[in-house]
């Protein structure tokens, strides 16, 4: 927890942020909360970013004040105006860019005092993998595909039956650059799979970890996948 200290005799108020990650091309949230004030007109929210000339966003006297907003953020930011009164200063960032990564500061002024907290925002691409049986292959083969990742992730296969086994010799992973020249499609193929087993394709970079599971039996195929963002921590 980081407490913003008051300046020139004003009290300090507690401001809390949570480190988070944004998925390139999608909308993201930069989380920030503060001790609420009873009067909306007394609350000022400023979002700043290291390396930015001006402000990312400013909200004061109950509305956006964007005269000093940096051009790179123009039209891409919004606070949750109806939640400011209850202490929510989180910022919605539209169409997240790779270059939006960095250190942000959520700076709050209320009638009670001032406070700020930094937030480390990571950007990249992450998507859910899908594992399928590759019926075109000569032997029993699984194919794990995920459409968008950045930075380049690692791919590891695992199986429920052969726990701890290393599948690197019987798998092949490729990365294909997508049309926007940043994110990549991940394709990993696992050979010599056995029936009545559950296989997992785990894709991970420094932003996210995603797993695609497939259970192949004589009678059916069951699939499951999940994605987890890494390094979300409060300040």
């Amino acid at each position: 927890l980081i407490i913003g200290f008051g300046i020139s005799g004003r009290h300090s108020i507690t401001v809390t942020t949570v480190a988070s990650a944004g998925n390139i091309g999608e909308d993201g949230i930069l989380s920030c909360t503060f001790e609420p004030d009873i009067k909306l007109s007394d609350i000022v929210i400023q979002w700043l970013k290291e390396g930015v000339l001006g402000l990312v966003h400013e909200f004061k006297e109950g509305k956006d004040e964007l005269s000093e907003q940096d051009e790179m953020f123009r039209g891409r930011t919004a606070v949750f105006a109806d939640q400011v009164i209850v202490g929510n200063a989180s910022l919605r960032l539209k169409n997240v860019q790779l270059t939006d990564a960095g250190t942000y500061k959520c700076y709050i002024i209320t009638s009670k005092g001032k406070g700020n907290a930094n937030l480390e925002y990571k950007t990249g691409a992450f998507s859910m993998p899908e594992v399928n049986v590759d019926y075109n292959a000569s032997s029993e083969t699984l194919r794990c595909e995920a459409p968008r990742w950045f930075p380049q992730p690692t791919v590891v296969w695992a199986s429920q039956v052969d726990q701890g086994a290393n599948f690197s010799e019987v798998s092949n992973t490729s990365f294909e650059l997508n049309s926007e020249n940043v994110t990549m499609k991940v394709v990993s193929v696992l050979y010599n799979v056995t029936i009545n087993n559950t296989y997992s394709c785990m894709i991970e970079n420094d932003i996210a970890k995603a797993t695609g599971d497939i259970k192949v039996t004589e009678s059916e195929i069951k699939r499951r996948s999940h994605l987890q963002l890494l390094n979300s921590k409060a300040s």
Partner: antibody, heavy 118, light 107 residues
Framework: EVQLVESGGGLVKPGGSLKLSCAAS????????MSWVRQTPEKRLEWVAG????????YYPDTLKGRFTVSRDNARNTLYLQMSSLRSEDTAKYFC???????????WGQGTTLTVSS | DTLMTQSPSSMSVSLGDTVSITCHAS??????IGWLQQKPGKSFKALIY???NLEDGVPSRFSGSGSGADYSLIISSLESEDFADYYC?????????FGGGTKLEIK
């Protein structure tokens, strides 16, 4: 067409002061952040100052803080750099650079030369 | 400060060659890097922004690549007007910092 024209350079004695100007045209000046960059005689580039679109936020390298002051007059479409306590190492060609839609160094002026010598 | 180490400082190349100029940042800069061209006695022209994006009006023989702390400017099929000085600049952190420059000369 975006145009940035610097002026005000010249020969100054060590310890002296000088104010540079950058006249902008061809774009909505008040919308964009601006910077001053200098190029030393050895062709090394150094960012000198930056200012937000409205002029309320200014930024400097620690090495120049206190001696250099950047300002802007959006009504006149002009950027300024006030320099004081000048030293021989401030001798350089000074360029103004405008942020465009893409980044902080999209457009550049032709530069104005400052020589600090006794 | 973020130190930008640019290499090579100069290179002699022939027309039609492909060249690569690299910049290494002393810390990650999240693609907040631009590439600039300066012709003798002239000002600067922006070529690449955000590491990989081509500025409007810049020929497609120029391209940028990289991520994290390492970035490159690639010029394919060099033409006579490409012989100039090239600089990288990072705008991820204050103070903004520039590479030392690369002089492209005709062999």
């Amino acid at each position: 067409e975006v145009q940035l024209v610097e002026s005000g350079g010249g020969l100054v004695k060590p310890g002296g002061s000088l104010k540079l100007s950058c006249a902008a045209s061809g774009f909505t000046f008040s919308r964009y952040a601006m910077s001053w960059v200098r190029q030393t005689p050895e062709k090394r580039l150094e960012w000198v100052a930056g200012i937000s679109s409205g002029g309320s936020y200014t930024y400097y390298p620690d090495t120049l803080k206190g001696r250099f002051t950047v300002s802007r007059d959006n009504a006149r479409n002009t950027l300024y750099l006030q320099m004081s306590s000048l030293r021989s190492e401030d001798t350089a060609k000074y360029f103004c650079a405008s942020q465009g839609s893409n980044h902080y160094f999209d457009y550049w002026g032709q530069g104005t030369t400052l020589t600090v010598s006794s | 400060d973020t130190l930008m180490t640019q290499s090579p400082s100069s290179m002699s190349v022939s027309l039609g060659d492909t060249v690569s100029i690299t910049c290494h940042a002393s810390q990650g800069i999240h693609n907040n890097i631009g590439w600039l061209q300066q012709k003798p006695g002239k000002s600067f022209k922006a070529l690449i922004y955000h590491g990989t994006n081509l500025e409007d009006g810049v020929p497609s023989r120029f391209s940028g690549s990289g991520s994290g702390a390492d970035y490159s400017l690639i010029i394919s099929s060099l033409e006579s007007e490409d012989f100039a000085d090239y600089y990288c600049v990072q705008y991820a952190q204050f103070p903004y910092t520039f590479g030392g420059g690369t002089k492209l000369e005709i062999k």
